[in-house]
């Protein structure tokens, strides 16, 4: 808290300019009018104010706008945004994508801070849904943004927004998140032809059910092993050896290197050894010939 002192003669700021960097904290407090600061916020970022000086400027704005800053000020906060607390940001009403971009630019190249997370939350809630332009912007600044959302939050993403998603945006998504995103992607890309569709849907397949994987196996897609390893185990288990062979195409040979890892390991345990042998890969652990396989889950469902 800066003490209230009179502004020295001749030091009253008539505009926000670079001469203010030579002002001590108490001089800034005494000589800079808050209303002037608010109208000339766009100049603040052009001047190398220190941490302490920015504290004083923030204090002046807080006094002028105790209920929260107007968007005209927020858009030009620049590095002053780094001084805001999540509590400050919760008072804001940010509706313009330009404002969001301007503030994300300040934090560019750095991890998402609590301030940024709060800002994004306020913005998205204000819009009611995560539209394509917003998603475009957020994933451009934070590729992992989508995977930081809960499945409930992801449910507000309209299928049209899925076009903005790049494969790297899904790198850290878990199966629960992909379960929500996959049906949206399937809907978004439904009018594409086979090979183009597969290119687009590939990074979402961690949420695909068995029937969709069976359908893909009929389309000569040649899925790579990295994608296969990210599939839901429960979706892979019912696939036959022939279906997996068709799904992977020339990549089927990669199963050998992954035979101890899920979902390959669990899938092998469900296949007849005879069928596995037809692949000629030396996969071991299948059901020995002559054994009867009882599907207990089916039995429970019938009883």
């Amino acid at each position: 808290e800066v003490e209230k002192t009179a502004c020295p003669s001749g030091k009253k700021a008539r505009e926000i300019d670079e001469s203010l960097i030579f002002y001590k904290k108490w001089e800034l407090e005494a000589c800079v009018d808050a209303a002037l600061l608010a109208t000339q916020m766009d100049r603040v970022n052009a001047i190398p104010f220190t941490y302490e000086q920015l504290d004083v400027l923030k204090h002046k704005l807080d006094e002028l706008y105790p209920q929260g800053y107007p968007e005209s000020v927020i858009q030009h906060l620049g590095y002053l945004f780094l001084k805001m607390s999540p509590e400050d940001i919760r008072k804001w009403n940010v509706t313009s994508l330009e404002t969001l971009k301007a503030l994300l630019e300040v934090n560019k190249g750095h991890e998402m801070s609590p301030q940024v997370a709060t800002l994004i939350d306020r913005f998205v809630k204000g819009r009611g849904q995560l539209d394509k332009d917003t998603l475009d912007t957020l994933t451009a600044f934070y590729p992992g943004y989508l995977c930081s959302l809960s499945p409930e939050e992801l449910s507000s993403v309209p299928p049209s927004s899925i076009w903005a998603v790049r494969p790297q945006d899904l790198d850290t998504c878990d199966p629960r998140q992909l379960d929500v995103l996959y049906p949206k992607a399937r809907l978004a890309f439904q009018n594409m032809n086979g090979s183009e569709y597969f290119v687009k849907i590939q990074s979402f397949l961690g949420g695909a059910p068995t029937e969709d994987l069976k359908a893909l196996s009929q389309q000569n897609v040649s899925m790579d092993l990295a994608t296969f390893m990210k599939l839901r185990t429960d979706a892979v288990l019912p696939l036959t050896v022939a279906e997996v062979q068709k799904l992977l195409g020339p990549h089927v040979e990669g199963l050998k290197a992954e035979e101890r890892h899920r979902p390959v390991r669990d899938w092998i345990l469900r296949q007849r050894q005879d069928d596995l042998d037809t692949l000629g890969l030396g996969l071991q652990g299948g059901i020995p010939n002559g054994y009867l396989v009882l599907d207990l889950s089916m039995q429970e469902a019938l009883s």
Epitope: E18, N45, P48, L82
Partner: nanobody, 114 residues
């Protein structure tokens, strides 16, 4: 953001030095930057600054003797110091943008005029 200041040393009164400050990323090409100094037992104070638009300003004590400049391609800021005086003895730091706003500083470079 890493800031690395260099170019300091021991110099006689009336001599010259050119300080350099390199930053990681494209920090200096887009931001306002400044040189600061801290004499023993004193507060850190601004010496020279350049706005993001390229205009410069100097502390009264160094006007006409010091010149701040930058090379965006090298992401480096310079401080040319001429007609040095004993009272210019201090550790010199540069800063700007994100790191300045969050109070992150480099190690500085020491200038002794004697």
């Amino acid at each position: 953001v890493q800031l690395v200041e260099s170019g300091g040393g021991l110099v006689q009164p009336g001599g010259s030095l050119r300080l350099s400050c390199a930053a990681s990323g494209s920090m200096f090409s887009i931001n306002a930057v400044a040189w600061y100094r801290q004499a023993p037992g004193e507060q850190r104070e601004p010496v020279a600054a350049m706005t993001s638009g390229g205009s410069t300003i100097y502390a009264d004590s160094v006007k006409g003797r010091f010149t701040i400049s930058r090379d965006n391609a090298k992401n480096t800021v310079y401080l040319q110091m001429n007609s040095l005086k004993p009272e210019d003895t201090a550790v010199y730091y540069c800063n700007g943008g994100w790191s300045l706003a969050l109070d992150y500083w480099g190690q500085g470079t020491s200038v002794t005029v004697s």
